[in-house]
Amino acid sequence: SAPGEDEECGRVRDFVAKLANNTHQHVFDDLRGSVSLSWVGDSTGVILVLTTFHVPLVIMTFGQSKLYRSEDYGKNFKDITDLINNTFIRTEFGMAIGPENSGKVVLTAEVSGGSRGGRIFRSSDFAKNFVQTDLPFHPLTQMMYSPQNSDYLLALSTENGLWVSKNFGGKWEEIHKAVCLAKWGSDNTIFFTTYANGSCKADLGALELWRTSDLGKSFKTIGVKIYSFGLGGRFLFASVMADKDTTRRIHVSTDQGDTWSMAQLPSVGQEQFYSILAANDDMVFMHVDEPGDTGFGTIFTSDDRGIVYSKSLDRHLYTTTGGETDFTNVTSLRGVYITSVLSEDNSIQTMITFDQGGRWTHLRKPENSECDATAKNKNECSLHIHASYSISQKLNVPMAPLSEPNAVGIVIAHGSVGDAISVMVPDVYISDDGGYSWTKMLEGPHYYTILDSGGIIVAIEHSSRPINVIKFSTDEGQCWQTYTFTRDPIYFTGLASEPGARSMNISIWGFTESFLTSQWVSYTIDFKDILERNCEEKDYTIWLAHSTDPEDYEDGCIAGYKEQFLRLRKSSVCQNGRDYVVTKQPSICLCSLEDFLCDFGYYRPENDSKCVEQPELKGHDLEFCLYGREEHLTTNGYRKIPGDKCQGGVNPVREVKDLKKKCTSNFLSPEKQNSKSN
């Protein structure tokens, strides 16, 4: 049951009648197989649903797929399978939806083995019409749209060719052979790795990184001895094999690969990996795997150049086997990230940072919860959040943590309260302040979603039995109402709402099972009549993000500035509306040493905010010293934290030191010490 589901709760009047008038059922006329759903464009109301049904026969697999379209947010669907000539669509490629509101859709068809190439169906009018196009190659990946121009597509073929189209898939040209990985960069640039000898796998570590800025007319080799590459924010990363051994290091470029700098990060061996956890135009979170099959590594955060890294979090959980990490960007509040660490006793604990990785702490225990059996002290424990790792371990966790940029401060997640993550059935917790404080929102596991920028939260109990009840809250999860959306319960498979959390419609997907058949069914509920009026000024209140000490003038300062938001009052039952824009008022803070990170060759001693020169350079610091670019070795010891906007206050600038003379080591030959590599 839901906390607060009682008479004292602020109940919405006559909600059953209001919702009953706005509940739309659609039964899909096909056998149950798999279903995939895509939204086409933003605020268009257009949804495409692809159902596929496989019958494995002795010799081959017989498949059937159907395509449905809605233009009213899922209230009604029309079977448009005839628009794609009743062709079987390959679900592993999904539906390739164009960027922004381009209205473009590409579906990749299943073709018989002997055909010269694949087949696609293209639409540029929000799936009203489709054009069939036969391809001169068999696609290995989904078509990738250029973020800048939705007419430009790229795809890899099963024979490792890189194919490009300049007219939205009408004509295709192979611009390079022997390609392993290709990605769009900015300004219609394509980056890709190629192999020279055997194959992608055989040449791993000996690949070349190429760039084309004119869709394949001309090329530039921008890296050799490449293991892999990645793009994050304005940074281009490549892991490059070392000359002497089988280790590799990260190199970074901020000019599309024209010039590279070695990142001051540990090198990794064959069995280890690097992973970009998050990146924006200011900085990067990088995970570096620990040697051995430990299942953990270290998070480092970068400076504004992506070159100098500070250790952010030890023993960060990231399984090598399944590639699972709980690292989550809390998009509803700037600077907040949540992840899991593997403690010495092999228990998993949740950590949170409010300052972009500067400091990590445990989550505060919710006031209305007691510590579970994992807690040594029944009065002192923390909230631990279930995310990707718990889901991969098949714990009773139907959903990862949820936050939305336009539902300021709201975070919803499954969790348990103790000294570590518990394998017991979790409850659902909510934070309304970006993760500083938490409250139990619902008992037991649930599916949940945010509508109308936080004005409504919807939840459905996770159950193995058929369901017919949905819960909703208009006060950020304090009080819940239940609505029976159908007399005949369905086997629930998922909640679907338009990405961006601006919609007031929710679709409940599931299937009905009778003696002979099972059919897909959706119920779309429009909450517009629950939120009868538009919100006015009086419905909003001011909230200072990151506030921990009202007495302190610097209260709320993160990365050199604080932000006051206008937020909907919990008791206001009104529509934020589709055009709602988060209102925030930033104010600049005075600088303190906390606004600076230690530059290369400097470190912060325990419990000290000053950066102190390292007495000697060892390990990866020494390697950076030897192979890094000379201009990066001249420093005053401090660099402003990326994105920090502070002004005035402390200015820790001091004399500039040249650290080149420290670049010596008994372990390196004299000639290495004299030569500099850029």
Epitope: C9, P550, E551, D552, Y553, D555, K570, S571, S572
Partner: antibody, heavy 124, light 107 residues
Amino acid sequence: QVQLVQSGAEVKKPGASVKVSCKASGYTFVAYYMHWVRQAPGQGLEWMGWINPNSGATRYAQKFQGRVTMTRDTSISTAYMELSRLRSDDTAVYYCARGKRSSGWYEGYGMDVWGQGTTVTVSS
Amino acid sequence: DIQMTQSPSSLSASVGDRVTITCRASQSISSYLNWYQQKPGKAPKLLIYAASSLQSGVPSRFSGSGSGTDFTLTISSLQPEDFATYYCQQSDVSPITFGGGTKVEIK
């Protein structure tokens, strides 16, 4: 210690204006809302509005809209409330009160520090 | 505007008595309800905020409960200094509104 000190009693004629000051000390002035509440003789409490000293933003009760102006001078940690076009039923004790804050929320947690009150008498 | 109705408007009680004052909002105000004590010629004093949180420095004999529309202020054992007028106030929806007050007198 935290305190709010208000200006002295005022006697005004109908149609005139009155400006009451409220000097804050012992805390960060810009970090808390300042509310103004009045109490007519023998009556209950009536909220007039608030000012956010940090931004200068205000919100007034509908009843006083157009007649009340709330301002602040952060350099001397002082809030002001000016009421114009005075009538005899504006005779009351006027209080400034600091809005209690909780984890970033500026409203909703009551008024935890009050001034001593300023008596305004409107009489012809 | 949200109307706040306090009851009773006055009550007589003796030292040591348990006293209960109720406050009803004309619509749900979640838990944004505060209680004040006012003595003659003095400014009000915050006792309880957010329906049930005790303001620092206030004796623990004062307690608050409720959420939504119905709220209660309880004085578990009335003391001589508790004879005063008590006001509830909602701070959830603008304009902020106060109840009419409950005067607690000596029996």
